[in-house]
Interface confidence: medium
């Protein structure tokens, strides 16, 4: 064996955003014929020597960063990319609004504003059907998400979450959906 074994992938099914009380499975996927899998939760360090972790009822304590690796013979693989498992529904939902309007002419700009009943300093925006979140607004203006030169691809249903940077894996419930309509197509 020359060099470390390639890293496995770690995924949460059905999603890494898990409402409190719901179930989730973390699955580590390496090459065929692995001798041993190790799935770890970081801070505090806990691990299971298997390729999956079933969480039947999501609790606050389950939220956090996870990674996995595997062993073949005496060789350990590189660790997987870390997976952030988020508990949602920990706090009341924020409200999501569009400025100047949720009907936006193509090529113009719109700002989606997420407002929390708490003094949270972190907000994140998701579009239905997209795999990832829109940019975290520390680069922007707290709860404002500017979307520039809008196109038809930005039409759709958005939700936001709020949380505190001191507890980054404990999120609010999702906002009510906001439907963004791109006009003039």
């Amino acid at each position: 064996q020359s060099g470390p074994l390639p890293k496995p992938s770690l995924q949460a099914q059905p999603s890494s955003l898990v409402p409190l009380g719901q179930s989730v499975i973390l699955r580590c996927q390496g090459p065929p014929d692995v001798d041993l899998y190790r799935l770890e939760k970081l801070k505090p360090e806990k691990y299971e020597d298997q390729d999956f972790l079933f969480i039947p009822t999501m609790e606050r304590s389950n939220a956090g960063r996870y990674r996995c690796s595997y062993q073949n013979g005496s060789h350990w693989s590189l660790p997987s990319d870390q997976l952030e498992l988020i508990a949602t529904g920990v706090y009341a939902k924020p409200s999501l609004s569009a400025h100047p309007s949720s009907a936006v002419p193509q090529g113009r700009d719109v700002t989606l504003k997420c407002q929390s009943p708490y003094s949270f300093d972190e907000f994140v925006l998701y579009k239905e059907g997209d795999t990832g979140s829109y940019k975290r607004p520390e680069k922007w203006y707290r709860a404002n998400f500017p979307i520039i030169t809008v196109t038809a691809a930005h039409s759709g249903t958005y939700r936001c979450y709020s949380f505190s940077s001191s507890s980054p894996y404990l999120w609010s419930a999702p906002s009510d959906p906001l439907v963004l309509v791109v006009t003039g197509l």
Epitope: Q106, G107, R108, K127, D130, Y134, I148, T151, H154
Partner: antibody, heavy 123, light 110 residues
Framework: QVQLQQSGAEVKKPGESLKISCQAS????????IAWVRQMPGKGLELMGI????????RYSPSFQGQVTFSADKSINTAYLQWSSLKASDTAMYYC????????????????WGQGTMVTVSS | QSVLTQPPSMSAAPGQKVTISCTGT?????????VSWYQQHPGKAPKLMLF???HRPSGVSNRFSGSKSDNTASLTISGLQAEDEADYYC??????????FGGGTKVTVL
């Protein structure tokens, strides 16, 4: 890899018409805004405007409105910049550039540039 | 449409640091985090060096960094190298599909 290939240099007389091109490869041409940028000899960069090839929606900077026309043919991944009547003051290097994005969201900068088309207008 | 204000030229010795300023208004630099920087060598097309004030595209050296305060953005080149000699342009989004560029700064490596 992602590339924008522009048409070759042009020498024209005042009053003539001209259409220069910018052919994209290596990405989904229809899904990114394309900008046209002018650079007059020894001067800085000026945004002329942008076009969305998906439906040829064009947006012109105020000082270029009515002076030029943008178009796009998504079947051949090509954007065009056109003049109906050239002036000596149109002498410049013209660049096409792609507005970059992360995921679905534009980040307000031009991440891929063509090599430029030099247009010389002289009697 | 007024350009953003940059110093026309700056110079420094190899290994030194140079910081280029780019001053606009609350309608452009101050109003958006969509400030970008481009490097242009003579006879070449511009190349994106930083976007969203301080983010480097892949392949750009970490010697290039950016920041913004109020209506002024800055590009810092640390550990200056001969190949950094070029013109540098800042740009800011100004809303509704329009951008403005700075007048450019010629950086000379002594």
């Amino acid at each position: 890899q992602v590339q924008l290939q522009q048409s070759g240099a042009e020498v024209k007389k005042p009053g003539e018409s001209l259409k220069i091109s910018c052919q994209a490869s290596g990405y989904s041409f229809s899904s990114y805004w394309i900008a046209w940028v002018r650079q007059m000899p020894g001067k800085g960069l000026e945004l002329m405007g942008i076009i969305y090839p998906g439906d040829s929606d064009a947006r012109y900077s105020p000082s270029f409105q009515g002076q030029v026309t943008f178009s796009a043919d998504k079947s051949i991944n090509t954007a065009y910049l056109q003049w109906s009547s050239l002036k000596a003051s149109d002498t410049a290097m013209y660049y096409c550039a792609r507005q970059g994005k992360t995921g679905s969201y534009y980040f307000g900068a031009f991440d891929v540039w063509g090599q430029g088309t030099m247009v010389t207008v002289s009697s | 449409q007024s350009v953003l204000t940059q110093p026309p030229s700056m110079s420094a010795a190899p290994g030194q640091k140079v910081t280029i300023s780019c001053t606009g208004t609350s309608s452009d630099v101050g109003g958006y985090n969509y400030v970008s920087w481009y490097q242009q060598h003579p006879g070449k097309a511009p190349k994106l060096m930083l976007f969203e004030v301080s983010h480097r595209p892949s392949g750009v050296s970490n010697r290039f960094s950016g920041s913004k305060s109020d209506n002024t953005a800055s590009l810092t080149i640390s550990g200056l190298q001969a190949e950094d000699e070029a013109d540098y342009y800042c740009s800011s989004y100004t809303g509704s599909s329009t951008w403005v560029f700075g007048g450019g700064t010629k950086v000379t490596v002594l």
